[in-house]
């Protein structure tokens, strides 16, 4: 279970929010859905 | 194109466990998050958690920490919600559903059909 | 956890009138010029529908008439000319932080 907020997981690339999962290394994952770069 | 197959409506005792299936088809499993959220009779929507079918991770509900686990099974595209010590409260329909992010250029919403647990 | 309230909790609106429901937040969901705020549309028997995102965004094949507008913890959507249709259950959604949370919902009739 990953506990985690998203707001607080925002850095800004190119002028794109991308939010890294604390699982997770890079941007490649699973789409969370409903936010903005969201992977999983 | 698209579908989120859900199993069949459940009759469970207070106390017992129940384990709902997701079946996802028409897209590369693993790119989208599955969310769950549920809906007692007559009443609103309260989301569960979601499972990342890509990394297995997941997050819950504060709500149901300890009674709720979301697994997956990449070689049959099925995503599982389990609840435990079911009661009478828990009766609901249980939906899973993918979305997309903002940033795609579309947003779409997939929801399956819907899986009617009754605890009594 | 953020809590979303919503109004009215029903609404009666004639055929062709505009309809307005409320929601607000108990606190900001925007983060960076960013609203996180959606709408689902739920009709009996069936799962909800993605209507609005990002607060002001149009879901894919959602009609003109629904609108969405808003910023901060205050929110509305629009039903800008109710039809037979549209007869539903209105949430809205907040996708700022988890755990995602919903409105009570508001049901729309016709008078």
């Known amino acids: 279970d990953a506990e985690f907020r998203h707001d607080s997981g925002y850095e800004v690339h190119h002028q794109k929010l991308v939010f890294f999962a604390e699982d997770v290394g890079s941007n490649k994952g699973a789409i969370i859905g409903l936010m903005v770069g969201g992977v999983v | 194109q698209v579908q989120l197959v859900q199993s069949g409506a459940e009759v469970k005792k207070p106390g017992a466990s129940v384990k709902v299936s997701c079946k996802a088809s028409g897209y590369t499993f693993t790119t989208y998050a599955i969310h769950w959220v549920r809906q007692a009779p007559g009443q609103g929507l309260e989301w569960m958690g979601f499972t990342s079918p890509y990394s297995g991770v997941s997050n819950y509900n504060q709500k149901f920490k300890g009674r709720v686990t979301m697994t997956r099974d990449t070689s049959t595209s099925t995503v599982y919600m389990e609840l435990s010590s079911l009661r009478s409260e828990d009766t609901a329909v249980y939906y899973c559903?993918?979305?997309?992010?903002?940033?795609?250029?579309?947003?779409?919403?997939?929801w399956g059909q819907g899986t009617l647990v009754t605890v009594s | 956890d953020i809590v979303m309230t919503q109004s009215p909790d029903s609404l009666a609106v004639s055929l062709g009138e505009r309809a307005t429901i409320n929601c607000r937040a108990s606190e900001s969901v925007d983060n960076d010029r960013i609203s996180f705020l959606n709408w689902y549309q739920q009709k009996p028997g069936q799962p909800p529908k993605l209507l609005i995102y990002?607060?002001?965004k149009q879901g894919t094949g959602v009609p003109d008439r629904f609108s969405g507008s808003g910023s901060g913890t205050d929110f509305t959507l629009t039903i800008s000319s109710l039809q037979a249709e549209d007869v539903a259950v209105y949430y809205c959604?907040?996708?700022?932080?988890?755990?995602?949370?919903f409105g009570g919902g508001t049901k729309v009739e016709i008078k």
């Open positions: 990002a607060a002001t």
């Open positions: 959604q907040q996708s700022k932080e988890f755990p995602w949370s």
């Open positions: 559903a993918r979305f997309d992010n903002y940033d795609r250029g579309y947003v779409r919403d997939y």
